[in-house]
Amino acid sequence: MMTGTIETTGNISAEKGGSIILQCHLSSTTAQVTQVNWEQQDQLLAICNADLGWHISPSFKDRVAPGPGLGLTLQSLTVNDTGEYFCIYHTYPDGTYTGRIFLEVLESSVAEHGARFQIP
């Protein structure tokens, strides 16, 4: 039985050209996290593997940085980055947990800074 829960930053917004941290946290389980995948729709952004460390997809290398922790930092944001992001925790022996974050990249200079993981 899966007992864990994933907390995420939820719905967040950021300015075009700026940066944002996508963060998920798995709690209430003793399961071993074997790998975390970060995906956007049907694109793999990055993998953090317990044995092999971080791997950023070649197509995102210039704009994605690993961390902090198991989170992911998106840089040089464009309006095309608006959309759903998923943190996928592969664990043993629980199985797979998924968290969802919706990012809105705003054209205006006054983006809402409500998220607790936001980079100023």
């Epitope: 039985m1 790998q35 995948n37 793999l44 593997n49 199985g95 797979t96 947990y97 998924t98």
Partner: antibody, heavy 120, light 107 residues
Framework: QVQLLESGGGLVQPGGSMKLSCVVS????????MNWVRQSPEKGLEWVAE??????????HYAESVKGRFAISRDDSKSSVYLQMNNLRAEDTGVYYC???????????WGQGTTLTVSS | DIQMTQSPASLSASVGETVTITCRAS??????LAWYQQKQGKSPQLLVY???TLAEGVPSRFSGSGSGTQFSLKITSLQPEDFGSYYC?????????FGGGTKLEMK
Amino acid sequence: QVQLLESGGGLVQPGGSMKLSCVVSGFTFSNYWMNWVRQSPEKGLEWVAEIRLKSNNYATHYAESVKGRFAISRDDSKSSVYLQMNNLRAEDTGVYYCTRLYYGNYFDYWGQGTTLTVSS
Amino acid sequence: DIQMTQSPASLSASVGETVTITCRASENTYSYLAWYQQKQGKSPQLLVYNAKTLAEGVPSRFSGSGSGTQFSLKITSLQPEDFGSYYCQHHYAFSYTFGGGTKLEMK
């Protein structure tokens, strides 16, 4: 212990359809991504399709060779995964295995396989 | 898609010998590589994952090594139960690729 049991194989004519089933026991099925892998003397082992969890909106992915012809689905209440195969070709002949994804990248449990023969 | 090429396609060895099977990837696999063993008439079994980590219950005479594009599976002091076929497998993004296999036969 973990068990995966495939069924539904048999002889079918080119252009025909067939539905494979796999029922699992020994682990919480609804927590794991499931895959179908096939094997033939000509092509060896070949990944066919993957289905994710309810929390992933049951997202599916397919090998190029079966896209548009095969459909993977699951019923968590029955601990079962299915493969609906349409417009079958001679090259689809082989042993079809139901597998559980482990560590985000690998297959730790396999069924005993069910044989599909596409021939006139 | 990344292509996985295994060599040799087949080899003969005796009980007690040491054998090495290699797997070459057409692109960098970042060590996301597994090895499986398959005995005649049975389904494959996971032996090694992440290039060098032994799966649960796998004897220590099996060892995986390599990174990037070149990988190998070494079996020391071959036992009768080790004969069969071996496959490498890579996963990246939304696709899984297997090598063509190596058949290990008793000399």
